[in-house]
């Protein structure tokens, strides 16, 4: 686990002609905020695809009003970092989308209006624990300057935040098979191993040796469904292992609901729907007035000024029952994707995903990479039913086991010479050409076809392609 951090340094007009109009005006003051979306691997997915690694939204920046006649300056920015926590390993290669949003603060009906001002995207390699990386991206006439890094949250360490460090138990050395944790030499690696036999489907651990159960499962290894332990199922006592399958009396037999309440069976017991003026598990409580506060979950009580007159609860959205005591079955809308099991926990919906899927709504397909490893620091990228390895620089092949020659494909255009380099390749361009791949002709007057050469690079200089 760890955190990706993004620091926005400036957002304003880029160099060159055609400065953009200020997004705010005296009539329509506005303020900026930013959204970052991260995806693992070097995916070129649509902007709308899920932010599988996470997303974050900045605070709103200061209110800005354009000064009439003045050019658009760098716009005032929100304070602080954008932080995207990630629960699992840091993938090393990632795609990002950074959006600049404008919040207009005029007198709109229905509150402020939001509009997307600029969107930049890129693909990068980044090791967790490294220094801040600086970047400049252009979107139309706008320019965004920012820095980013990924850092591990203790006890995780390493370039992927997959190694765990614990304080040493003995002062001199780590246990068998465990190495010291660089740079924390006074700590030792601790592999995260759940308790032996812990159910991989229904159990998980956050500390080595533990086995914590997902909702609906119990037992030391999370292998026992909750319903079989107490067996209040509609159909009588449990057979040895398969749950409540033996036919028996239903829980509504003989109608346990008093005072005219109607009984309905539930998976584990029964439920009474009570007439007005009565509540309780079996509609046994009566003589209630609004002064007794009979409406639950924020329901509004009307009438019922004395015990002889019935009260009515007007329930807020999402609740029902004569006392607003029942939550509407939100799972019936089937929000979980890919066959996930929906659980309504009251404060939130949870999806228990089938093997091979993950995410809050089981929207991420992990199947293609399950049990497959990419060698030499490669990252597995799923898609289309077949796994693919995004290989570290210098390696190639299906599983990144082959040494790659970055110059083999002759990437340098117009007679440029290619040199293999530890971080990729370098093109030394022939006279008259420039660019990372020597793809841009230099015009006779010295201007290039590029919108702007990167700072510090002259036409004809070797350029490293990252």
């Amino acid at each position: 686990a760890g955190v990706f951090e993004l620091q926005i340094h400036s957002f304003g007009p880029g160099p060159g002609p055609g400065a953009p109009r200020s997004p705010c005006s005296a009539r329509l003051p506005c303020r900026l905020f930013f959204r970052v979306c991260l995806k693992p691997g070097l995916s070129e997915e649509a902007a709308e695809s899920p932010c599988a690694l996470g997303a974050a939204l900045s605070a709103r920046g200061p209110v800005y009003t354009e000064q009439p006649g003045a050019p658009a300056p760098d716009l005032p920015l929100p304070d602080g970092l954008l932080q995207v926590p990630f629960r699992d390993a840091w993938p090393g290669t990632f795609s990002f989308i950074i959006e600049t949003w404008r919040e207009e603060l005029g007198d709109q009906i229905g509150g402020p209006a939001w509009s997307l001002l600029a969107r930049v995207a890129g693909r990068r390699r980044l090791a967790a624990g490294g220094p801040w990386a600086r970047d400049i991206q252009r979107a139309g006439a706008w320019e965004l300057r920012f820095s980013y890094r990924a850092r591990c949250e203790p006890p995780a360490v390493g370039t992927a935040c997959t190694r765990l460090c614990r304080p040493r138990s003995a002062p001199s050395r780590c246990g068998p098979g465990l190495r010291p944790c660089a740079p924390l030499e006074d700590e030792c690696e601790a592999p995260l191993v759940c308790r032996a036999g812990c159910s991989p489907e229904h159990g998980f651990c956050e500390q080595p040796g533990e086995c914590r159960c997902l909702e609906g499962w119990t037992g030391p290894l999370c292998t026992v469904p909750v319903s079989t332990s107490s067996c209040l199922s509609p159909r009588g006592p449990s057979s040895a292992t398969t749950g409540c399958l033996v036919p028996g009396p239903g829980p509504c037999d003989g109608n346990p609901c008093a005072n005219g309440g109607s009984c309905s069976e539930t998976p584990r017991s029964f439920e009474c729907t009570c007439p007005r003026g009565f509540y309780g598990l079996r509609c046994e409580v009566s003589g209630v007035t609004c002064a007794d506060g009979p409406c639950f979950n924020g329901g509004l009580c009307v009438g019922g000024a004395d015990p002889d007159s019935a009260y009515i609860c007007h329930c807020p959205p999402g609740f029902q029952g004569s006392n607003c005591e029942k939550r509407v079955d939100r799972c019936s809308l089937q929000p979980c994707r890919n066959g996930g099991l929906c659980l309504d926990l009251g404060h939130a919906l949870r999806c228990r995903c089938r093997a091979g899927f993950a995410g809050p709504r089981c929207e991420h397909d992990l199947d293609d990479c399950a049990g497959r490893a990419c060698a030499n620091g490669g990252t597995c990228v799923e898609g289309g039913g077949a796994h693919r390895c995004s290989c570290a620089l210098g390696f190639g092949g299906r599983d990144c086991r082959e040494r790659a020659d970055p110059c083999a494909a002759r990437p340098c255009a117009h007679g440029g010479r290619c040199y293999a380099h530890f971080s990729g390749l370098v093109c030394a361009c022939a006279p008259g050409y420039m660019g990372a791949r020597c793809e841009f002709p230099v015009h006779p007057d010295g201007a290039s076809a590029l919108p702007a050469a990167p700072p510090g690079l002259r036409p004809g200089d070797p350029q490293r392609y990252l």
Epitope: A55, L57, G318, R330, Q334, P360, R361
Partner: nanobody
């Protein structure tokens, strides 16, 4: 904050038609699932029709063949075309949506409801 605003309710005779609309607005990144529930007096709220998280359409048995759900993704709006209406369709119809916010969290939202009355 996210708002769901329903419209199109009213009184209609048996066999008549109505079209309900529900527009979602606010700080929405994407809509995962969206649909219509209804609650008749003294009854539990039940799902009428919806688009699931997997974008399938689902209908309650009692409305199949009579009601049609559709949507306009660009407007974050869902519609319920109700025809061959019966007295038992009388209820408050609520729009519901499972929404992904910009924070990447999902939240479930309800509209305030629109009343549909079917009577001769």
């Amino acid at each position: 904050e996210v708002q769901l605003v329903e419209s199109g309710g009213g009184e209609v005779q048996p066999g008549g038609s109505l079209r309900l609309s529900c527009a979602a607005s606010g700080f929405i990144f994407s809509i995962n699932a969206m649909g219509w529930y209804r609650q008749a007096p003294g009854k539990q709220r039940e799902l009428v029709a919806g688009f699931t998280g997997d974008t399938n359409t689902i209908y309650a048995e009692s409305v199949k063949g009579r009601f049609t759900i559709s949507r306009d993704n660009a407007k974050n709006t869902v519609y319920l075309q109700m025809s061959s209406l019966r007295a038992e369709d009388t209820a408050v119809y609520y729009c519901a949506a499972d929404v992904q916010l910009f924070s990447r969290d999902y939240e479930f939202y309800w509209g305030q409801g629109t009343l549909v009355t079917v009577k001769p």
